[in-house]
Interface confidence: low
């Protein structure tokens, strides 16, 4: 079976004009997934990103996340790239409210 992930991108403010953007994938199966941040379509170096472990979420599916820190006002330049079971999707940083997207393939 394949269960596509729910992808949720959120922002949280940090000091000095920076924000942390977090891309969360949840409720997916199997556990193998790729999440990475891109700036202007180019993948960020791994030393500028942090990943959470892929963990069971209690429903027979899995969850994980990737985060990076960016300058406030540059949110539109960043997207979260997700790849799961041969499918892929790109998810923008929300402007204003949290963006939650159910992947549709």
């Amino acid at each position: 079976r394949t269960v596509p992930p729910m992808v949720n991108v959120t922002c949280s403010e940090v000091s000095e004009g920076n924000i942390t953007v977090t891309c969360r994938a949840s409720s997916f199966y199997p556990r193998n997934i790729t999440l990475t941040w891109r700036q202007d379509g180019v993948s960020l170096s791994h030393n500028t990103q942090q990943w959470g472990d892929v963990l069971p979420d209690g429903n027979g599916t899995y969850q994980t996340w990737v985060a990076t820190r960016i300058r406030q006002g540059e949110e539109q330049r960043f997207t979260c790239y997700m790849e799961h079971s041969g499918n892929h999707g790109t998810h923008p940083v929300p402007s204003g409210k949290v963006l939650a997207l159910q992947s549709q393939w």
């Epitope: 556990r31 790729t34 379509g41 791994h46 030393n47 990943w51 790849e83 892929h88």
Partner: antibody
Framework: QVQLQESGPGLVKPSETLSLTCTVS????????GHWIRQPPGKGLEWIGM???????DYNAAFISRVTISVDTSKNQFSLKLSSVTAADTAVYYC?????????????WGQGTLVTVSS | EIVLTQSPGTLSLSPGERATLSCTAS???????LHWYQQKPGQAPRLLIY???NLISGIPDRFSGSGSGTDFTLTISRLEPEDFAVYYC?????????FGQGTKLEIK
Amino acid sequence: QVQLQESGPGLVKPSETLSLTCTVSGFSLTTYGGHWIRQPPGKGLEWIGMIWTDGWTDYNAAFISRVTISVDTSKNQFSLKLSSVTAADTAVYYCARKGHGYYYAMDYWGQGTLVTVSS
Amino acid sequence: EIVLTQSPGTLSLSPGERATLSCTASSSVSSSYLHWYQQKPGQAPRLLIYSTSNLISGIPDRFSGSGSGTDFTLTISRLEPEDFAVYYCHQYHRSPFTFGQGTKLEIK
């Protein structure tokens, strides 16, 4: 059956451009990414770069000024171009498939092709 | 650059014995991004274990992986003749995505 096959000239002159193609079968490059790796004779493995399923690339910074990886999904091929080669670029060049969610690991490899840089 | 140091450089053992191969990273590597490959003479490398401890389908369960942070281990519980080869660890945690220099497992 998953297969990858590297092809290209076995001999390249110094300062010229090394061009290799990886032809794949048993899967589609629209659903799997690809890596290029090289191995100088008698030495270890060195990652050159990769191409994602949607065509974006990541490169080893050591090569970034002279490397290009591209894909032609209609031919099920992805390619490596390495410019301004020197004798230090003599190596066996491998293409490999990026496994699904295997955290960029390479789950299938071509058999490799030896490229010698010499005048 | 994260440097992966494998030890020992060469390991001489007999079939039936247990092999323990070490991979030490110069800085911390997420367990998700540490992989092991096997390479036999004249052949391409083959993925054995991904994300530290996950065995690739078709790889015998005498192979196992463990570790975290900077210290990772590949263990072969009972060596078979076909296991004698060079083993590489590989990290895709931080660019450039490096390999260890390899451990050669040879027949004693």
